[in-house]
C-alpha cells in the first residue's frame, strides 16, 4: 500500500531512550518513538526508544498488546516522554486499558 512505503527523506524525531539498548544515552533519533512493557519472569520491564528505520517499527507498532508484551508508538519530538505502555485487561487487546494501578 502506498502509505506504507518509506519516504525518500524521512523526518527524524528525537525520542526519550530508557532501556537495554540505550547505553549511556537518554535519547535517540529515529523515524518513530516507542514505549514498551515486557514481562520478564513476572517482572515488569519498561523501555523507551526509537526505530531508526521505517521497516523496523512497522510490524512492531502494529502488533496488539498481549499478556506479556505491549508497545505504543508515536511520531513527534519527545512524543514518548509521557507514554507508558500498558498490558491489556483480560479479554481485551488494545492500548489504553490498564491491568494495574498504584497504591
Amino acid at each position: 500500500m502506498e502509505d506504507e512505503k518509506p519516504k525518500v527523506n524521512p523526518k527524524l524525531y528525537m525520542c526519550v531512550c530508557e532501556g537495554l539498548s540505550c547505553g549511556n544515552e537518554d535519547h535517540c533519533e529515529g523515524q518513530q518513538c516507542f514505549s514498551s512493557l515486557s514481562i520478564n519472569d513476572g517482572f515488569h520491564v519498561y523501555q523507551k526508544g526509537c526505530f531508526q528505520v521505517y521497516e523496523q517499527g512497522k510490524m512492531t507498532c502494529k502488533t496488539p498488546p498481549s499478556p506479556g508484551q505491549a508497545v505504543e508508538c508515536c511520531q513527534g519530538d519527545w512524543c514518548n516522554r509521557n507514554i507508558t505502555a500498558q498490558l491489556p485487561t483480560k479479554g481485551k487487546s488494545f492500548p489504553g486499558t490498564q491491568n494495574f494501578h498504584l497504591e
Epitope: L20, I39, D41, F43, V45, K90, N99, F100
Partner: antibody
C-alpha cells in the same frame, strides 16, 4: 496498610510435599503480580516463582521448575506455593512478596520456615 | 543467567561513616536493579528501586546510582539502625540477587 502473611511451613521428609499460603490484605489483590522468594539458613535470597494477576501465567527458575507450583485464589486474596519432591536444599524461609508495576518486590511478608530433613 | 557480584561481602564501620557497597552485573541490565536491607530474623526491606529511586519512607541518607553493569548503594552517614545485610537484585532477565554485604559495627 499492605499486609502479607505466610503460613504452612514446617518439617517435612525428603521427597515429601508441602503447601504454603500467603494471605494478602490492604490492597486490591487481583490487580497485582505476586512472588515467592526463599532464603536458606545463613544464605542469600533466591527468587523462586511469580504469578500474574489472573493466575494464567506462572514463572520459575530451573532449580524448582517441575517440582513447585504457584497458584492464586483472587476470591480469597491468597497466593499458594505447592512444593513437591522436596530436597534438603529446599530448607529455607519462604517469603511472599508483591510489586507495583514499576516497583518490584516493594512489600514482603514475614516468612515461613520450611525444613526438609529425615 | 545474569550473575550479580556484590563487594565487599562484609565491612566494619562506625556511626557517622560514609559507606559504599557495589554490585556488578555479568551483563547489561540498564537500571533494572533494586537494593534491599535485611536485619536478622526479619524480611528484606526495599530501599532503592530502578537503580536510583528512593522508596517511600526510606531515609535520604540512602542513595543508589549506576546503569548497565556497575551499581552503587551509598549510606551518607551510617546510623545505629543501619547495621544489617544489604542485597542488590536485578530483574532485567532471570531475576537474581547479589550474595549480600554485611555491615557490622567497628
Amino acid at each position: 496498610e499492605v499486609q502479607l502473611v505466610e503460613s504452612g511451613g514446617g518439617l517435612v521428609q525428603p521427597g515429601g510435599s508441602l503447601r504454603l499460603s500467603c494471605a494478602a490484605s490492604g490492597f486490591t489483590f487481583s490487580n497485582y503480580y505476586m512472588y515467592w522468594i526463599r532464603q536458606a539458613p545463613g544464605k542469600g535470597l533466591e527468587w523462586i516463582s511469580s504469578i500474574n494477576t489472573d493466575g494464567g501465567s506462572t514463572y520459575y527458575p530451573d532449580s524448582v521448575k517441575g517440582r513447585f507450583t504457584i497458584s492464586r485464589d483472587n476470591s480469597k486474596n491468597t497466593v499458594y506455593l505447592q512444593m513437591n519432591s522436596l530436597r534438603a536444599e529446599d530448607t529455607a524461609v519462604y517469603y511472599c512478596a508483591k510489586s507495583t508495576p514499576n516497583i518490584p518486590l516493594a512489600y514482603w511478608g514475614q516468612g515461613t520456615l520450611v525444613t526438609v530433613s529425615s | 543467567d545474569i550473575q550479580m557480584t556484590q563487594s565487599p561481602s562484609s565491612l566494619s564501620a562506625s556511626v557517622g561513616d560514609r559507606v559504599t557497597i557495589t554490585c556488578k552485573a555479568s551483563q547489561n541490565i540498564y537500571k533494572y536493579l533494586n537494593w534491599f536491607q535485611q536485619k536478622p530474623g526479619k524480611a528484606p526491606k526495599l530501599l532503592i528501586y530502578y537503580s536510583n529511586s528512593l522508596q517511600t519512607g526510606v531515609p535520604s541518607r540512602f542513595s543508589g546510582s549506576g546503569s548497565g553493569t556497575d551499581f552503587t548503594l551509598t549510606i551518607s552517614s551510617l546510623q545505629p539502625e543501619d547495621f544489617a545485610t544489604y542485597y542488590c537484585f536485578q530483574y532485567s532477565s532471570g531475576p537474581t540477587f547479589g550474595q549480600g554485604t554485611k555491615v557490622e559495627i567497628k
